[in-house]
C-alpha cells in the first residue's frame, strides 16, 4: 500500500531505515520557495516553520478571489512530498517555507532573489546543519537568478530545481539552467517522461536526472488530513530534495559534487523511452531516474564520473563549445560531437585556473558539442600533456611521463579544415600502453592523473560493417573516464560517454562507403580507484 | 549550462548628450541590458541592477543613490525597492525604461536585468 513514487525511489533495503542522523535528530533543513502552505496539515505539522518571508506579485484579474486552501495548494503538496509523515520522502526533515509564489502560482525573479538572499542571511545569522533549497518554479533564462544560485551553492547550500513543464529545453529556463543546481525532470509510474496536457517535462543537457512527477499523492491544503495527487517537475524536484535531505541526514559532510555524482551513479538507468524527446535532444538528455543511494560507507571509494555536455557551438566557422566540470570535480577527458561530422576536434585548456573541455566547429559544419567527463577523484593531481601536429605522414605520440600518472583521456584537434586530407587519430593500447597517438595534422592532448590507487586501462571495440554507432562498456567495478572514436577512412560524428558506455558515432553517408578492413573503433579508458593500491596502467 | 540561451541582451551604450556632467560623460557604458525572451513574462518598469562582484557595501548604496539623484535631475522619480548585499551586489529599482541608458553608465554596473515572472511547476 506504499504510493508508487516512494516505492520507485526508495529501494527495498531503505524502506525501514529511519531518516535520522546518528544522534537521533535530523539536522538537515529544507527551504521551500513556493506558495504559502498549510502548516496545520497532519503530514507536515510540527516539522514545518512558516517564515514571515513574503515577496509575491499581485494576483491578476479584478475578480480574483483569494481562497486560502487554493493559495496553499502547491506548496503544501510539495512540503508533504519532501517531509510528509506518510507520503514524504524524508519523513523526519524540518522544512522552512518562504512565500515567493502568489495564489495563482506566479512569482518574480526579483522575489525569488530576495528569498534566496533571506536564506543566505539566515545562514549567516544562525549557522546550522546542511541546507537544501527546493525551487519548484521556473521562468525564462535569467542570468542573475542563475548567478544567485551559484553564489548560494558556493556557500555549501544544495539547490534542487524543477526542470520546467514546458516540453522544451531546460536550458532556456531559470533556475533550471544554472549548473550549480540539481535540475530534475519528471517521469510517470511507467518511468516515461511526464506529459502535462499539450506540454510536459523539460529535457536536455541542463537536466541532471528525472524523478517521479505524475499523479503524486501528497498533502492537500483542502483539509488537515486530506490528500490529493499533483503532477509536474515540482513534484519530481521535491522527491530529489527529499533524497538529498536523507543523504545529508546520514552523512552531513557530503558536498554538492558528491551528492550529484551519487544521485547520478545510483539512479535507475535506461528505462526512459527517449523517443518522447525531440531527436536533437535525445543524446543530451540523461536516461536516469532517481533512487535513494546507499551510504558511502556501504559503497566504498568508488570512482564516480558524469558526462557534461556543452551548449551547442553554433554554425560559424570558428565556433567553439565549452564544457565545464564543477569546481570540485576533475576533468578526466574531453571529446566532441557534431551531427554533421564536420568538427575540428577537441582539447583541454585552462581558463581562470580551471581545466575546461573545448570543441571546435569546422567549415561547413552545423556546430559542435564539447563533452566533458567530470569525475570525483580524491586527492587527485591531474595535468594535460599536448603535442603539436606532426609533419605529413608522421604519428604524434603523447603519454603520461610523470611517475605514477595514468592516462585518463585523449583529445585530438586538427589544424587543417579539409576533412578529406587528414587521417584520423588513434589510441593504441597494446603496442604503446597509456599513449594517445595522433596522425597527420592532429594536435594530441593526454589527460594524466595521479591519485592514490588510481588504475586505468584501454578497452576497444571495433565494427567493420555498416553501423551508425559503435559502443564499448567498462566492466563492473571500472568507471569510464575517456571515450574516443578511432575510425578507418570514414567521417565520424564524434564520441561521448553515456554512463559507463563509450559511444562512437559514424556519419550515415559514410556507412555504405566503408570497406570491411576499415573498422570504426570505440576506445574507452576505464579506471578504478583502489585506495590501497598504487597508481598504475593496466595492460 | 550557464551560457545565455534564448535570451535578449541589448547593448545600450547610449551617448549622454542631455547631461554634461563630467563623471557621467567620462564613463562609457560597457554594461548590458538583459530581458526575458518571452515577452509575456516580462515586467517592464522593474529592474535588477547587478554590480561588479567586488563592489563594496557602501558603493552599492552610493550607486543606488546616484541613480536616484541623476533620475531626479531629469524629472524622473525612481524607487529603490531592495538592496542586495549578501548573495551579490546590486539593487532592485522601479523606474521608467527611459532611464536604462543612464543606469548602464553608472560606475560598478555589470548588467541590468528586467524583472520577469516565474511560475509554479
Amino acid at each position: 500500500s506504499i504510493p508508487w513514487n516512494l516505492e520507485r525511489i526508495i529501494p527495498a533495503w531503505h524502506q525501514t531505515e529511519e531518516d535520522r542522523s546518528p544522534d537521533g535528530s535530523s539536522q538537515v533543513e529544507v527551504y521551500l520557495l513556493d506558495t504559502s502552505i498549510q502548516g496545520a496539515h497532519r503530514e507536515i505539522e510540527g516539522r514545518v516553520t512558516i517564515t514571515d518571508f513574503n515577496s509575491v506579485p499581485e494576483e491578476d484579474g479584478t475578480r480574483f478571489h483569494r481562497q486560502a486552501s487554493k493559495c496553499d495548494s502547491h506548496g503544501t503538496h510539495l512540503a508533504g512530498v519532501v517531509s510528509g509523515r506518510d507520503a514524504g520522502v524524508a519523513k523526519g526533515t524540518s522544512l522552512h517555507s518562504l512565500r515567493v509564489l502568489n495564489c495563482q502560482g506566479k512569482g518574480t525573479v526579483s522575489g525569488t532573489l530576495i528569498g534566496l538572499e533571506f536564506i543566505r542571511k539566515s545562514q549567516l545569522i544562525q549557522p546550522s546543519g546542511p541546507l537544501v533549497v527546493l525551487l519548484p518554479l521556473a521562468g525564462g533564462y535569467s542570468r542573475i537568478l542563475n548567478a544567485a544560485c551559484r553564489h548560494l551553492a558556493r556557500t555549501g547550500v544544495v539547490l534542487v530545481a524543477a526542470a520546467g513543464n514546458f516540453r522544451d529545453d531546460a536550458c532556456l529556463y531559470s533556475p533550471a539552467s544554472a549548473p550549480e543546481v540539481i535540475t530534475v525532470g519528471a517521469t510517470n509510474a511507467q518511468d516515461q517522461p511526464v506529459t502535462l496536457g499539450t506540454l510536459g517535462t523539460n529535457f536536455g543537457r541542463c537536466v541532471d536526472l528525472f524523478a517521479p512527477g505524475k499523479d503524486i499523492i501528497g498533502a492537500s491544503s483542502d483539509c488537515s488530513t486530506c490528500f490529493m495527487s499533483q503532477s509536474g517537475t515540482s513534484q519530481a524536484a521535491a522527491h530529489v530534495a527529499g533524497i538529498v535531505a536523507r543523504m545529508l541526514s546520514r552523512e552531513p559532510t557530503l558536498t554538492l559534487a558528491e551528492l550529484r555524482q551519487r544521485l547520478i551513479h545510483f539512479s535507475t538507468k535506461d528505462v526512459i523511452n527517449m523517443a518522447w524527446f525531440p531527436e536533437d535532444q535525445q543524446v543530451l538528455t540523461p536516461n536516469l531516474v532517481a533512487t535513494l543511494p546507499p551510504s558511502t560507507h556501504e559503497t566504498g571509494g568508488q570512482l564516480l564520473c558524469r558526462t557534461v555536455w556543452s551548449a551547442h557551438s553554433g554554425p560559424t566557422r570558428t565556433a567553439t563549445a565549452t564544457a565545464r566540470c564543477a569546481p570540485e570535480e576533475e576533468l578526466l577527458s574531453c571529446s566532441s560531437f557534431s551531427r554533421s561530422g564536420r568538427r575540428r576536434g577537441d582539447w583541454i585548456e585552462a581558463i581562470g585556473g580551471q581545466q575546461v573541455c573545448k570543441a571546435l566547429n569546422a567549415f561547413g559544419g552545423e556546430g559542435v558539442y564539447a563533452v566533458a567527463r567530470c569525475c570525483l577523484v580524491p586527492r587527485a593531481n591531474c595535468s594535460i600533456h599536448n603535442t603539436p601536429a606532426a609533419r605529413a605522414g608522421l604519428e604524434t605520440h603523447v603519454h603520461c611521463h610523470q611517475k605514477d600518472h595514468v592516462l585518463t583521456g585523449c583529445s585530438f584537434h586538427w589544424e587543417v579544415e579539409d576533412l578529406s586530407v587528414r587521417r584520423q587519430p588513434a589510441l593504441r593500447s597494446r603496442r604503446q600502453p597509456g599513449q594517445c597517438v595522433g596522425h597527420q595534422a592532429a594536435s594530441v592532448y593526454a589527460s594524466c592523473c595521479h591519485a592514490p590507487g588510481l588504475e586505468c586501462k584501454i578497452k576497444e571495440h571495433g565494427i567493420s560493417g555498416p553501423s551508425e554507432q559503435v559502443t564499448v562498456a567498462c566492466e563492473a567495478g571500472w568507471t569510464l573516464t575517456g571515450c574516443n572514436v578511432l575510425p578507418g577512412a570514414s567521417l565520424t560524428l564524434g564520441a561521448y560517454s553515456v554512463d559507463n558506455l563509450c559511444v562512437a558515432r559514424v556519419h550515415d553517408t559514410a556507412r555504405a562507403d566503408r570497406t570491411s578492413g576499415e573498422a570504426t573503433v570505440a576506445a574507452a579508458i576505464c579506471c578504478r580507484s583502489r585506495p590501497s593500491a598504487k597508481a598504475s596502467w593496466v595492460q | 549550462q550557464d551560457e545565455d540561451g534564448d535570451y535578449e541582451e541589448l547593448m545600450l551604450a547610449l551617448p549622454s548628450q542631455e547631461d554634461g556632467l563630467a563623471d557621467e560623460a567620462a564613463h562609457v557604458a560597457t554594461a548590458t541590458f538583459r530581458r526575458c525572451s518571452k515577452e509575456a513574462w516580462r515586467l517592464p518598469g522593474t529592474y535588477i541592477v547587478v554590480l561588479m562582484e567586488e563592489t563594496q557595501r557602501l558603493q552599492i548604496e552610493q550607486t543606488a543613490h546616484r541613480l536616484q539623484t541623476r533620475a531626479a535631475r531629469r524629472g524622473y522619480v525612481i524607487k529603490v525597492l531592495h538592496i542586495f548585499y549578501d548573495l551579490f551586489p546590486g539593487f532592485l529599482v522601479k523606474m521608467s525604461s527611459d532611464l536604462l541608458g543612464l543606469a548602464l553608465k553608472l560606475p560598478h554596473v555589470e548588467y541590468i536585468e528586467e524583472d520577469s515572472f516565474v511560475f509554479a511547476q
Epitope: 500500500s1 504510493p3 509523515r85 507520503a87 483542502d222 488537515s224 488530513t225 486530506c226 | -
Partner: antibody, heavy 126, light 106 residues
C-alpha cells in the same frame, strides 16, 4: 472483522497520569492506510478527538491537549496506548479508541473514524 | 478551532416522520463533514461522510447535504432503531465534533 478494545484503570487521582491501551484484533495495526485514534466523551457531553498515531509511531494531537498527551504504538502486541498527564476532574470521560483512515491510500476508504471500541469510563477523583 | 453548532438540541418525532438535523460550522469546512449515530452505551457509528456520501451498510433513508458552513442530515422516514443521538464532525482543520442532537420518540 476488525475489533478494538480499550483497557486500563477506571479511576485515576487528580494530578496523576491516565494510562489506557487499545488492543486491535481481526487485523494488523501495521498498515500505511490507517491511523489509530483516541476520542473521549465526558458524561452527557459531546465527543472530543485527543490524538492519533500510525504504526511507525508518527503522532499528531489535538492542539488544546497537546502538552499533556502521549500516544505510543507497540506493533508486536498489535496495541496502541494513551497517556494523559496532570489530570483533573474535567478529564472524566468515556475514552474510545478508533481507527482513522489515513487518506494516503485512496482505496482504503474515506478519511473518517470507524470502527470504534466500545469505550471505557475513566473517572478522575481522589 | 472550528466550532460546530448542532440544532435543535432535541428533536421529538414519531416513527415514520421525517427528521431534519442541522449542523453549522464557525467557518467553512468545505464538504469535509461527517455524521455519526450513537445509541446509549454504544460507540458512535459513521453514517455519512464528506457531507453527502453514505457509509457502507447505511440505509438509503439517511442522506446528507450542504457545504461550506451549513449542513443537514435528513432521515426520510424514522424507524424505531433510528432514535439516538447524532453528531456532526469536521476534518477541515483537525477534528471537532458538534454538541449532538437527540432524536427522541414523541
Amino acid at each position: 472483522q476488525l475489533q478494538l478494545q480499550e483497557s486500563g484503570p477506571g479511576l485515576v487521582k487528580p494530578s496523576e497520569t491516565l494510562s489506557l491501551t487499545c488492543t486491535v484484533s481481526g487485523g494488523s495495526i501495521v498498515s500505511s492506510s490507517y491511523y489509530w485514534a483516541w476520542i473521549r466523551q465526558p458524561p452527557g457531553k459531546g465527543l472530543e478527538w485527543i490524538g492519533s498515531i500510525n504504526y511507525k509511531g508518527s503522532t499528531y494531537y489535538n492542539p488544546s491537549l497537546k502538552s499533556r498527551v502521549t500516544i505510543s504504538v507497540d506493533t508486536s502486541k498489535n496495541q496502541f496506548s494513551l497517556k494523559l498527564s496532570s489530570v483533573t476532574a474535567a478529564d472524566t470521560a468515556v475514552y474510545y479508541c478508533a481507527r482513522e483512515n489515513s487518506g494516503v491510500v485512496p482505496a482504503a476508504g474515506p478519511n473518517w473514524f470507524g470502527p470504534w471500541g466500545q469505550g471505557t469510563l475513566v473517572t478522575v477523583s481522589s | 478551532e472550528i466550532v460546530l453548532t448542532q440544532s435543535p438540541a432535541t428533536l421529538s418525532l414519531s416513527p415514520g416522520e421525517r427528521a431534519t438535523l442541522s449542523c453549522r460550522a464557525s467557518q467553512s469546512v468545505s464538504s469535509y463533514l461527517a455524521w455519526y449515530q450513537q445509541k446509549p452505551g454504544q460507540a458512535p457509528r459513521l453514517l455519512i461522510y464528506d457531507a453527502s456520501n453514505r457509509a457502507t451498510g447505511i440505509p438509503a433513508r439517511f442522506s446528507g447535504s450542504g457545504s461550506g458552513t451549513d449542513f443537514t442530515l435528513t432521515i426520510s422516514s424514522l424507524e424505531p432503531e433510528d432514535f439516538a443521538v447524532y453528531y456532526c464532525q469536521q476534518r477541515r482543520n483537525w477534528f471537532t465534533f458538534g454538541g449532538g442532537t437527540k432524536v427522541e420518540i414523541k
